[in-house]
Interface confidence: medium
């Protein structure tokens, strides 16, 4: 399943770097979230639970991020034009079932005033 | 499974259009392709198969295409500047398991000569 | 094409031990969960031991607790269960399976790609 | 830990009939973490349908599976030649996993 555009604010500037938000419904317990940069796996992150209710976050591909009971947050850093392009929330959810696979995204527009080093 | 760019030639232009080449590995039974603009579905081709291996196609979003045993071309007419976008081929296995997702896509550049209607 | 191949069983007597290997082939090893699961000659399934991705997290039936340790190696794309105390009880063949979503995890996952199976006799 | 009870133990049916198996758990089953899976005899389980109702890859629409809570069926619409095995449910919920008994759909 394909969601399309997602329809919340999905990048959310401050200091140089860029917080992309993907969100997940709060029901989702087992999920993939994966952040794509046009058809790159940028970042990686699987929480899945165990015995005892025991929760391991897997990530294959790392980058600094967040989680919450409805999100993850990637946090990408030092930013520059390069870093303009389609960003996707690439969300498997294994729990509850049935297995689905939702993708949202956007396009990151940098701005002069969002870079990290403006040349003065 | 996000594979990313995909490692062969994805657009073949002719006659001011493009054949959007989306690729499957042979041994892929059942599935379904979507083509995406950014984010958004364009196309969409579904092949199943029932008792006496009957092979059902269904196409929730239509556009012309074209099913070989190890792909599926999306055509697409009229080309202007607008058609500049990133692509994916967003295909999702059915058979043989395990259901799996594998995005592949690229940038689709419009060069003056590819147009369909070139200003004279 | 993927393939679970499981290895080591044959015949021991009660209280002797056994280790089984299975080993996957044309899979992402440590994208799954894995679990044994055994079926008595004749008999039902029973699930025995499941473990998650990178073996952090693993779990067992009540009948071999204590006996069974659930390992694995992803290094050698490989799960094993080492049996000890065994008892006639644990005559059986025995499946590995994998977990259907590719989740990592064993818990709260149904199995869809299993061995053939190896069977384990516990005799005097 | 949860036991799963099947019904029948056999159904005796013809090609082309229905079938409706049962399976019944001891205490609820949140969130329908059931399997269902087929068997024939010298091979492994073939999983059918996860989450009580959803159809795994490559399954024939045929089969389909319904229920919440403590009981859940399995329905085979039109019995092929091929369908004639035992049937187990599968409990994925709570610690230790448990499978019912089976039930066998042979050929009358």
């Known amino acids: 399943e394909i969601n399309g555009s997602a329809n919340y604010e999905m990048f959310i500037f401050h200091n140089g770097g860029v917080q992309i938000l993907c969100k997940y419904p709060d029901i989702v317990q087992q999920f993939k979230m994966q952040l794509l940069k046009g058809g790159q796996i940028l970042c990686d992150l699987t929480k899945t639970k165990g015995s005892g209710n025991k929760v391991s976050i897997k990530s294959l591909k790392f980058c600094h991020s967040q989680l919450s009971n409805n999100s993850v947050s990637f946090f990408l850093y030092n930013l520059d034009r390069s870093h303009a392009n389609y960003y996707f929330c690439n969300l498997s959810i294994f729990d509850p079932p049935p297995f689905k696979v939702t993708l949202t995204g956007g396009y990151l527009h940098i701005y002069e005033s969002q870079l990290c080093c403006q040349l003065k | 499974e996000i594979n990313g760019s995909a490692n062969y030639e994805m657009f073949i232009f002719h006659n001011g259009g493009v054949q959007i080449l989306c690729k499957y590995p042979d041994i892929v039974q059942q599935f379904k392709m979507q083509l995406l603009k950014g984010g958004q579905i364009l196309c969409d081709l579904t092949k199943t198969k029932g008792s006496g291996n009957k092979v059902s196609i269904k196409s929730l979003k239509f556009c012309h295409s074209q099913l070989s045993n190890n792909s599926v071309s999306f055509f697409l007419y009229n080309l202007d500047r607008s058609h500049a976008n990133y692509y994916f081929c967003n295909l999702s296995i059915f058979d043989p398991p395990p259901f799996k997702v594998t995005l592949t896509g690229g940038y689709l550049h419009i060069y003056e000569s590819q147009l369909c209607c070139q200003l004279k | 094409e993927v393939q679970l191949v499981e290895s080591g069983g044959g015949v021991v007597r009660p209280g002797g031990s056994l280790r089984l290997s299975c080993v996957a082939s044309?899979?992402?090893?440590?994208?799954?969960?894995m679990s044994w699961v055994r079926q008595a000659p004749g008999k039902g399934l029973e699930w025995v031991s499941g473990?998650?991705?990178?073996?952090?997290?693993?779990d067992y039936s009540d009948s071999v607790k204590g006996r069974f340790t659930i390992s694995r190696d992803n290094a050698k794309n490989s799960l094993y269960l080492q049996m000890n105390s065994l008892r006639a009880e644990d005559t059986a063949l025995y499946y590995c399976?994998?977990?259907?979503?590719?989740?990592?995890?064993?818990?709260?996952?149904?199995?869809?790609?299993w061995g053939q199976g190896i069977l384990v006799t516990v005799s005097s | 830990e949860i036991v799963l009870t099947q019904s029948p133990g056999t159904l005796s049916l013809s090609p082309g009939e229905r079938a409706t198996l049962s399976c019944r758990a001891s205490?609820?089953?949140?969130?329908?973490?059931l399997a269902w899976y087929q068997q024939k005899r010298g091979q492994a389980p073939r999983l059918l349908i996860y989450?009580?109702?959803s159809r795994a890859t490559g399954i024939p629409d045929r089969f389909s599976g319904d229920g919440s809570g403590t009981d859940f069926t399995l329905s085979i619409s039109r019995l092929e030649p091929e369908d004639f095995a035992v049937y187990y449910c599968?409990?994925?919920?709570?610690?230790?996993?448990?499978f019912g008994p089976g039930t066998k759909v042979d050929i009358k």
């Open positions: 399976a994998r977990d259907f979503y590719g989740s990592g995890s064993y818990y709260h996952v149904p199995f869809d790609y």
């Open positions: 044309g899979v992402t090893f440590d994208d799954y969960g």
């Open positions: 473990i998650n991705w990178n073996g952090g997290d693993t």
């Open positions: 205490q609820s089953v949140s969130r329908s973490y």
């Open positions: 989450g009580a109702s």
């Open positions: 599968h409990q994925y919920d709570m610690s230790p996993f448990t």
